[in-house]
């Protein structure tokens, strides 16, 4: 014959544990029912009565089977630099993630504690590593033969156009200018190279920034919380 199923509350056999979705109440010394997600223990069990569960109040939750006397408070409303990717319900906490163009600079167990805008790379620098949900952009100086004339968190260094005759040589922050109506070829895949003036290439074309007082040694600041490597300020 099958063993008789015990109904909560019941005294466990010596050395045995309570079943799934049950807990051992030290005071009653009985195995008692846990409350389901979205509920909490309103009245703890006794030797003769099981746990009495009640629904979580607004703005509180329990995610797991439990016997907590009070539901957990949902996190505060998402800040202006965040979006709510999971609403506060009786069964789950609110989760806030950073809005597009921002990254999580200080994380917490679930979601993000503090968002920061993705930094942009200045003219003469391109994106070495794009920003992610949890890390900032990393910039790198444009190598000889390449340039970036934008302030952008996405633009990489692009090759200078190749000219039959060069009117103005390119540098790290400006494309080469050709004297002929069109360049012989461009190393930039899929890029459309317009004839002069070069400013038609980008709405953000800028003259080469004047030198700053920054040192000539190069310096890459970190992506997210990782230490920087040294390299050129490009100033």
């Amino acid at each position: 014959l099958p063993a008789q199923v015990a109904f909560t509350p019941y005294a466990p056999e010596p050395g045995s544990t309570c079943r799934l979705r049950e807990y051992y109440d030290q005071t009653a010394q009985m195995c008692c029912s846990k409350c389901s997600p979205g509920q909490h223990a309103k009245v703890f069990c006794t030797k003769t009565s099981d746990t009495v569960c009640d629904s979580c109040e607004d703005s509180t939750y329990t995610q797991l089977w439990n016997w907590v006397p009070e539901c957990l408070s949902c996190g505060s409303r998402c800040s202006s630099d965040q979006v709510e990717t999971q609403a506060c319900t009786r069964e789950q906490n609110r989760i806030c993630t950073c809005r597009p163009g921002w990254y999580c600079a200080l994380s917490k167990q679930e979601g993000c504690r503090l968002c920061a805008p993705l930094r942009k790379c200045r003219p003469g620098f391109g994106v070495a590593r794009p920003g992610t949900e949890t890390s900032d952009v990393v910039c790198k100086p444009c190598a000889p033969g390449t340039f970036s004339n934008t302030t952008s968190s996405t633009d990489i260094c692009r090759p200078h156009q190749i000219c039959n005759v060069v009117a103005i040589p390119g540098n790290a922050s400006m494309d080469a200018v050709c004297t002929s109506t069109s360049p012989t070829r461009s190393m930039a895949p899929g890029a459309v190279h317009l004839p002069q003036p070069v400013s038609t290439r980008s709405q953000h074309t800028q003259p080469t920034p004047e030198p700053s007082t920054a040192p000539s040694t190069s310096f890459l600041l970190p992506m997210g919380p990782s230490p920087p490597a040294e390299g050129s300020t490009g100033d």
């Epitope: 930094r119 302030t151 919380p225 040294e230």
Partner: antibody, heavy 121, light 110 residues
Framework: QSVEESGGRLVTPGTPLTLTCTVS????????MGWVRQAPGKGLEYIGF??????TYYANWAKGRFTISKTSSTTVDLKMTSLTTEDTATYFC?????????????????WGQGTLVTVSS | DIVMTQTASPVSAAVGGTVTIKCQAT??????LAWYQQKPGQPPKLLIY???TLESGVPSRFSGSGSGTEFTLTISGVQCDDAATYYC????????????FGGGTEVVVK
């Protein structure tokens, strides 16, 4: 290259005031400019900055009361409202170093001499 | 919010000696840290950025170290001219913060 602040004066509480930062030899479309203040005998206090692309960021306490804007190719303004005696300080304008090729790093390598704002009744 | 805490003032040093100033961040800021020197009546002067990179024109007796939450500014072979207040500043977070600067540490040279 230089940075100079102007507009600091004695004002009564509640009076709005605008400070101007005038730069020379600095392209404001390439560099980020910030404001920092220092109360008499106290430490440095970050206010905020305006990036080369025109985005503004502020310290929590400055949000809503302080506004940074570019007013020309050589000037950046700091507009202050609802001033109290706690706002008495020397206000510095400074250029972001742009280290690592970043548009802004929050680290300033060229500072003006500052302009004194006194709020008193 | 990230808060920067510095060595209490004042710190005394003899000419030719060594001074160490510590700066602690409440959260990891990687190497986004700068050190400034300020003398009375003058604006701050950037000494070090990236925790350890010396700004152009700054004497090599100044050095910086650390990453994460613990940082140090060291002045070796202290000179009379080094008497000033020194500030650390984090550049990791510049929005949703109350201040990016530490409280400052005054160095007195005897």
């Amino acid at each position: 290259q230089s940075v100079e602040e102007s507009g600091g004066r004695l004002v009564t509480p509640g009076t709005p005031l605008t400070l101007t930062c005038t730069v020379s030899g600095i392209d404001l479309s390439s560099y980020t400019m910030g404001w920092v203040r220092q109360a008499p005998g106290k430490g440095l206090e970050y206010i905020g900055f305006i990036s080369s692309s025109g985005h503004t960021y502020y310290a929590n306490w400055a949000k809503g009361r302080f506004t940074i804007s570019k007013t020309s190719s050589t000037t950046v303004d700091l507009k202050m409202t609802s001033l109290t005696t706690e706002d008495t300080a020397t206000y510095f304008c400074a250029r972001d170093g742009g280290y690592g090729g970043y548009d802004y790093t929050g680290i300033f390598n060229l500072w003006g001499q500052g302009t004194l704002v006194t709020v008193s009744s | 919010d990230i808060v920067m805490t510095q060595t209490a003032s004042p710190v005394s040093a003899a000419v030719g000696g060594t001074v160490t100033i510590k700066c602690q961040a409440t959260e990891s800021i990687s190497s986004w840290l700068a050190w400034y020197q300020q003398k009375p009546g003058q604006p701050p002067k950037l000494l070090i950025y990236g925790a350890s990179t010396l700004e152009s024109g700054v004497p090599s007796r100044f050095s910086g170290s650390g990453s994460g939450t613990e940082f140090t500014l060291t002045i070796s072979g202290v000179q009379c001219d080094d008497a000033a207040t020194y500030y650390c500043q984090q550049g990791y977070i510049y929005t949703n913060v109350d201040n990016t600067f530490g409280g400052g540490t005054e160095v007195v040279v005897k």
